[in-house]
């Protein structure tokens, strides 16, 4: 965990000082240093550092929480409050946002940004594609065309003088339209199915 707080073990102790002298403060444990010729080391409780565990650590200043997690130093413990989509003591685990998140009615789960969303099949909407979409809600038929919901989408019944899937093309007085080429058998005023 190179991104986290440095090792809480203190530095090698002063020469001539042994563990019997009680050099480790704040609950630190003295390791080694049985005699004046061998150096001791202090293992410091979380929240303290220094050769004798004499320094209080501002552990949050080292930004131990990954992926935008919020750091909380509780004194005896460090907590990371993770953003959605991340977990672990240091928010180090990127959750599979789509795991166990089925999108209904043929929708496809799309991961990203620590969250998931569903790309819904035509005719469905909502967070999990469970809602039947009203394709006419957005008033897709232009120039006063009337919208009809259809199992495969919507159908526009165009007002006189307009044509096209969304009634977007005016019909000229001579019978020509702004369409590049109308499909054969399609007359102005016929319902235009939008697929």
């Amino acid at each position: 965990y190179p991104y986290d707080v440095p090792d809480y073990a203190g530095m090698l102790g002063s020469s001539g000082v042994t563990c019997a002298d009680g050099p480790c403060f704040n609950g630190g444990l003295c390791v080694g240093g049985a005699d004046p010729d061998s150096a001791y080391i202090c293992h410091c409780p979380p929240g303290f550092q220094g050769s004798n565990c004499e320094k209080r650590v501002d552990r949050c200043s080292l930004q131990p929480c990954r992926n935008g997690g919020l750091c909380l130093d509780l004194g005896h413990a460090l907590r990371c409050r993770c953003r959605a989509g991340f977990a672990g003591p240091r928010c180090e685990h990127d959750l599979d946002d789509c795991a166990g998140r089925a999108c209904a009615n043929g929708g496809t789960c799309v991961e990203g940004g620590g969250a998931h969303r569903c790309s819904c099949a035509l005719g469905f909407g909502g967070r999990d594609c469970r809602e039947r979409a009203d394709p006419c809600a957005a008033r897709p038929c232009a120039h006063g065309g009337r919208c009809y919901a259809h199992f495969s989408g919507l159908v526009c019944a165009c007002a006189p003088g307009y044509m096209g899937a969304r009634c977007e093309f005016p019909v000229h007085p001579d019978g020509a339209s702004a369409l590049p080429a109308a499909p054969p058998g399609l007359r102005p005023g016929d319902p235009q199915r939008y697929l």
Epitope: Y1, D4, D7, A20, V31, P45, A77
Partner: antibody, heavy 118, light 108 residues
Framework: QVQLQESGPGLVKPSETLSLTCTVS????????WSWIRQPPGKGLEWIAY???????NYNPSLKSRVTISLDTSKNQFSLQLSSVTAADAAVYYC????????????WGQGTMVTVSS | EIVLTQSPGTLSLSPGERATLSCRAS???????LAWYQQNPGQAPRLLIY???SRATGIPDRFSGSGSGTDFTLTISRLEPEDFAVYYC?????????FGGGTKVEIK
């Protein structure tokens, strides 16, 4: 309140390696040192080793050559391995959390009995 | 290593009486880094006292600890039925961490 649960085989053959795992019930594994302690039947307590997630470890010199302690933060677990076991290693093995102020033990697992027999 | 010797090995008392348990170290326990534990049969030890005299969370005030250097004492002012158990001292000033051999407090 955090809870600790030891797991591993209750029976080990002489000369084999004993492997035990302790599962921590919450995400506090990075906040504390974690330790193993054992107690032979009818006898006192013996500290084995401790570990901190940064990599700091410390072992009882009487067991150091045979003991390995490790930690897996992703699983909220730490483990003990004791090699070349003999009948003298039969004991209740406890995992414990090291107190936040000094190396006493404030939370203990319920213990798991390990028998050494062929 | 620091060797801790507990005495007496067994203490026979009645409920309501005062219990005094001793823990003596082979060398000075630095910074009064000494703890006491209670263990009932078939259960894990429970931390009672740390820093020689500080009660752990949830420990009744009938338990008290004292001492420094090499001599430490655990006192139970009035024994309750649930206090009959084995008590261990532990030093955590110098590695290796060591425990005493225990004192059994039994009903007389």
């Amino acid at each position: 309140q955090v809870q600790l649960q030891e797991s591993g085989p209750g029976l080990v053959k002489p000369s084999e390696t004993l492997s035990l795992t302790c599962t921590v019930s919450d995400n506090s594994i990075s906040n504390y040192y974690w330790s193993w302690i054992r107690q032979p039947p009818g006898k006192g307590l013996e500290w084995i080793a401790y570990i901190y997630y940064s990599g700091t470890t410390n072992y009882n010199p009487s067991l150091k050559s045979r003991v390995t302690i490790s930690l897996d933060t992703s699983k909220n677990q730490f483990s003990l391995q004791l090699s070349s076991v003999t009948a003298a290693d039969a004991a209740v093995y406890y995992c414990a959390r090291v107190f936040h102020w000094g190396f006493a033990f404030d939370i203990w697992g319920q213990g798991t009995m390990v028998t050494v027999s062929s | 290593e620091i060797v801790l010797t507990q005495s007496p090995g067994t203490l026979s008392l009645s409920p309501g009486e005062r219990a005094t348990l001793s823990c003596r170290a082979s060398q000075r326990v630095s910074n009064t880094y000494l703890a006491w534990y209670q263990q009932n049969p078939g259960q894990a030890p429970r931390l009672l006292i740390y820093g020689a005299s500080s009660r752990a969370t949830g420990i009744p005030d009938r338990f008290s600890g004292s001492g420094s250097g090499t001599d430490f004492t655990l006192t139970i002012s009035r024994l309750e039925p649930e206090d009959f158990a084995v008590y261990y001292c532990q030093q955590y000033g110098t590695s290796p961490l060591t425990f005493g051999g225990g004192t059994k407090v039994e009903i007389k």
